[in-house]
């Protein structure tokens, strides 16, 4: 079955971070083009990246419609030209991607420390609430809006003068920690979804240290 001289796509891979979702595959096309279809388990197939010569397809627009749905996708291979001139043996070749559940499978992007403020022996560290491409009522939702209390942040902090790290956790985007007066501290945060079995943690944020721009200090 399949059309002559076409090769089925292989190595179909979902690449998804903070719901920005791209399906990638191989091989680079030679005398063929690809079309991707996506659907929910109960829905109709919708064609995307029609007759493309790329080996990736941005499916973000479709999966953000409902990030808690399960999505199916497949990649069709068509000969590069009409079938009458290239020869046909019925339906085109296609390859199924593995099921994709955005809420479960999207990776957490690297977080950013928005600010920190010291008041006496307390420091308030705020994590930037990153915007996603998920929409509700025509506005983009933040990561916290989407994941709610499923999302926590872990703060790693240490004295600039030593390497011993301490940790704190929060299910908001703010930490309030105790520090030693007169000491400078460095901070890094990590996003975590504890209920997940895979893709539980983001990479660590860039390190921010007291005595640099992002901080405010009040006695």
């Amino acid at each position: 079955s399949g059309t002559t001289n076409t090769v089925a796509a292989y190595n179909l891979t979902w690449k998804s971070t903070n719901f920005k979702t791209i399906l990638e595959w191989e091989p680079k096309p030679v005398n063929q083009v690809y079309t991707v279809q996506i659907s929910t388990k109960s829905g109709d197939w919708k064609s995307k990246c029609f007759y493309t010569t790329d080996t990736e397809c941005d499916l973000t627009d479709e999966i953000v419609k409902d990030v808690k749905q399960t999505y199916l996708a497949r990649v069709f291979s068509y000969p590069a030209g009409n079938v009458e001139s290239t020869g046909s043996a019925g339906e085109p070749l296609f390859t199924n991607a593995r099921k994709f559940l955005p809420y479960r499978d999207t990776k957490l992007g690297q977080p950013t420390i928005q600010s920190f403020e010291q008041v006496g022996t307390k420091v308030n560290v705020t994590v930037e609430d990153e915007r996603t491409l998920v929409r509700r009522n025509n506005t983009f939702l933040s990561l916290r809006d989407v994941f709610g209390k499923d999302l926590i942040y872990t703060l790693y902090y240490w004295k600039s003068s030593s390497s011993g790290k301490k940790t704190a956790k929060t299910n908001t985007n703010e930490f309030l920690i105790d520090v030693d007066k007169g000491e400078n501290y460095c901070f890094s945060v990590q996003a975590v979804i504890p209920s997940r079995t895979v893709n539980r943690k983001s990479t660590d944020s860039p390190v921010e240290c007291m005595g640099q721009e992002k901080g405010e200090f009040r006695e």
Partner: antibody, heavy 119, light 113 residues
């Protein structure tokens, strides 16, 4: 010789539906991708929709997505365009066209059928 | 979406003279793997459907007179009628078939001066 003959056009009120047909002859219909292209009176050409030779994949212009549905019946050598929720701006001559040497290159066109959306 | 911009909007040329129509795409329609430009030219006479003249930017469709030629690459393309004939009075459209949605230029009307 290759022939594409559209039918089903006419005057329709906004919000109503219409189904266009395109009867194909003179070639192996099931081997070719097919398109609908429209032309508003005195204006340029606008691509509307495409369907692959097998009928599995369909793609639409943003302006008609969710309102129009392209389909084909390879046993009847016929292409269709179901147009729902019609608007005044859908008023145009609708052409069916065949993929030629490559996808999206139209080597044969029908004569067109006029759709007028007016109250 | 790739935007196709044609110039001029209209053109009046004497019989036997050269007519040149330009078409610019908002992004390249050249596919590097096969070095082909995914651009076509059509001619449309009043009351008729368009007729394919040229594809791959410079390949003449079978039966099209050799006074019609296409050139250009990447984002800038030209259709040339080397010696205008009376039957060439029409509107000419460029179209990219590089990526969907397919898009046409706004058209150039060619008339006899």
């Amino acid at each position: 010789q290759v022939q594409l003959v559209e039918s089903g056009g006419g005057v329709v009120q906004p919000g109503r539906s219409l189904r266009l047909s395109c009867a194909a002859s003179g070639f192996t219909f099931r081997s070719y991708g097919m398109h609908w292209v429209r032309q508003a009176p005195g204006k340029g050409l606008e691509w509307v929709a495409v369907i692959t030779y097998d009928g599995i994949n369909k793609y639409y212009a943003d302006s008609v997505e969710g309102r129009f549905t392209i389909s084909r019946d390879n046993s009847k050598n016929t292409l269709y365009l179901q147009m729902n929720s019609l608007r005044a701006e859908d008023t145009a001559v609708y052409y069916c066209a065949r993929d030629g040497v490559y996808y999206g290159v139209y080597d044969y066109w029908g004569q067109g059928t006029l759709v007028t959306v007016s109250s | 979406d790739i935007v196709m911009t044609q110039s001029p909007d209209s053109l009046a040329v004497s019989l036997g003279e050269r007519a040149t129509i330009n078409c610019k795409s908002s992004q390249s329609v050249l596919f590097s793997s096969n070095n082909k430009n995914y651009l076509a030219w059509y001619q449309q006479k009043p009351g008729q459907p368009p007729k394919l003249l040229i594809y791959w930017a410079s390949t003449r469709e079978s039966g099209v007179p050799d006074r019609f030629s296409g050139s250009g690459s990447g984002t800038d393309f030209t259709l040339t009628i080397s010696s205008l004939q009376a039957e060439d009075v029409a509107v000419y459209y460029c179209q990219q078939f590089h990526s969907y949605p397919l898009t046409f230029g706004g058209g150039t009307k060619v008339e006899i001066k």
